[in-house]
């Protein structure tokens, strides 16, 4: 969790000299309890956002908005602190609004925005806003959080970002899978503008057990500068069980910018389905009715099974 | 001394309800999310729930969604874990724990038994 | 969800010994995984975080490397009092599931 690297972070408007300071999360008025305290926000809502830095970089950022309520307790409000913690790293940020002048009613409602908290793909946050001073120890809260979840890189807009592009958002790979004769799999797939290598990896399942009966991995090789764009195709062997028919394909790339981080790429094969004409098989070619014997089984094996090379199309 | 001490464990029919408490103590309890972990006998470690610090964030492992319900009171510096409509299945260990700033669960309480049988 | 697999589940060797578990996740979690271990009839404890960042009061002989879906835990001298089951537990998002675990002892 940070701050963007803004100027300088500004909450003045008109009618109210303010200024934004780091803070500890922990204000002062709970350690020092005043007696009178102002109410809580209102109509807390915080929206996906996006901002650029100096150096031109893109990052989503939290948008926080609040307005006040129309009580009399704006005359006791002196600011307001905004508190973001990323809920699976227990990391907490905070700022707080210092308030130079006194708030007075005036004809609009008071409404406060805050847009320099950076926030990562797929990930979740609690965003509260406290109005200052905190009430005492048995006050009634005068706080109001909300969650919010940021999309993952997926997301049409996040894909553009620096941490999406970063882990290889912009890449669409294309795959396609193709079930060729005497039990094999094609997979095909776009290769990027890098020369980087490249894994496929084959995971099978049983179409009613969700535990891999079946799995293979395949590297590609670095492709050259006139490979870039094209297509790579990568050929397995599949169990020889015909129940292990329900395939999981992955392309994982090593990006120079994300190296074994890279968001990858999937597809699925569903089992064929049998109609109803079809001649049962026996049950024993569905059901492994014993262990078969150590070196005579394509159960777990990553072994070479089969061809991996680049295909070009000029 | 940052503590957790988890109670409310016990046995009970299958159906049946139990409400387990974790009091905390040695730290700023409002400041934390909080973690309800449990244990079936000779079993591994498995995640229930968690719940931000100012409870808008809630979420459960699909084994226990619909029957649990997981809550704080940060002015008692305690966590709860209410559930329903337990199950044989639902016999562990139930901790408590705190996450660490930086991912993983740093502090863990002493743990409380619930034991579901006919 | 993702699935998070370890092996071995369980390993025998000796004092002094290399030690290697490895925790597996089904897709990409980055370096969103913890490591703790727990020995019997005790809670458990956290030994690594952030994959590769050793807790503080843990011996330095713990050591925990990867990102993405691949990562291991080292113990470079294996000791007696390391005997335990050693977790992984994934946390990039909710839920934070654990590894089935790895039983470590003493040959």
């Known amino acids: 969790l940070r701050l963007l690297d803004h100027r300088a972070l500004v909450c003045s408007q008109p009618g109210l000299n303010c200024t934004v300071k780091n803070s500890t999360c922990l204000d002062d008025s709970w350690i020092h309890p005043r007696n009178l305290t102002p109410s809580s926000p209102k109509d807390l809502q915080i929206q996906l956002h996006f901002a650029h830095t100096q150096q031109g970089d893109l990052f989503p950022v939290a948008h926080i908005e609040w307005t006040l309520q129309t009580d009399a307790s704006i005359l006791y409000l002196e600011g307001a602190e905004l508190s973001v913690l990323q809920l699976n790293t227990n990391e907490r940020l905070c700022v707080r609004f210092e308030f130079l002048s006194k708030l007075r009613h005036h004809h609009r409602r008071w409404r406060f925005t805050f847009s320099h908290f950076v926030v990562d793909p797929d990930q979740e946050y609690e965003v509260t806003v406290h109005h200052l001073p905190k009430p005492i120890p048995d006050g009634d809260p005068n706080h109001q959080s909300k969650n919010f979840l940021v999309p993952d890189c997926e997301h049409a807009r996040m894909k553009v970002t620096t941490p999406c592009m970063s882990s290889g958002s912009l890449w669409d790979p294309n795959i396609t899978v193709e079930t060729l004769e005497a039990h094999q799999l094609r997979v095909s797939f776009t290769l990027w503008n890098e020369s980087t290598p490249y894994q496929v990896l084959l995971e099978s399942f049983s179409d009613s057990e969700n535990h891999s009966c079946f799995d293979v991995v395949k590297q590609i090789f670095a492709p050259r500068q006139e490979e870039f764009h094209q297509r790579a195709n990568v050929t397995f062997t599949l169990s020889k069980f015909h129940w292990c028919c329900h395939h999981h394909v992955q392309v994982q790339p090593f990006f120079s910018s994300c190296l074994n981080d890279c968001l990858r790429h999937a597809v699925t094969v569903p089992c064929p389905v049998i109609s109803n004409t079809t001649v049962p098989k026996p049950v024993a070619d569905y059901i492994p009715l014993w262990e078969p014997r150590s070196g005579s089984s394509d159960y777990k094996d990553d072994d070479d099974k089969g061809s991996s090379h680049h295909h070009h199309h000029h | 001394e940052v503590q957790l001490v988890e109670s409310g464990g016990g046995s009970v029919q299958p159906g049946g309800s139990l409400r387990l408490s974790c009091a905390a103590s040695?730290?700023?309890?409002?400041?934390?999310?909080m973690n309800w972990v449990r244990q079936a006998p000779g079993k591994g470690l498995e995640w229930v729930s968690i719940?931000?610090?100012?409870?808008?964030?809630?979420h459960y492992a699909d084994s226990v969604k619909g029957r649990f319900t997981i809550s704080r009171d940060n002015a008692k510096n305690s966590l709860y874990l209410q559930m329903n409509s337990l199950r044989d299945e639902d016999t562990a260990v139930y901790y408590c724990?705190?996450?660490?700033?930086?991912?993983?669960?740093?502090?863990w309480g002493q743990g409380t038994t619930v034991t579901v049988s006919s | 969800d993702i699935q998070m697999t370890q092996s071995p589940s369980s390993l025998s060797a000796s004092v002094g010994d290399r030690v290697t578990i490895t925790c597996r996740a089904s897709?990409?979690?980055?370096?969103?995984l913890a490591w703790y271990q727990q020995k019997p009839g005790k809670f458990p404890e956290l030994l690594i975080y952030?994959?590769?960042t050793l807790q503080s009061g843990v011996p330095s002989r713990f050591s925990g490397s990867g990102s993405g879906t691949d990562f291991t835990l080292t113990i470079s001298s294996l000791q007696p009092e390391d005997v335990a089951t050693y977790y992984c537990?994934?946390?990039?998002?909710?839920?934070?599931?654990f590894g089935p675990g790895t039983k470590v002892d003493i040959k």
């Open positions: 724990a705190r996450p660490k700033v930086g991912g993983g669960m740093d502090v």
């Open positions: 040695g730290f700023t309890f409002s400041s934390y999310s």
């Open positions: 719940i931000s610090s100012r409870s808008s964030i809630i």
């Open positions: 897709q990409g979690i980055s370096n969103y």
């Open positions: 952030a994959a590769s």
């Open positions: 537990q994934k946390y990039n998002r909710a839920p934070f599931t």
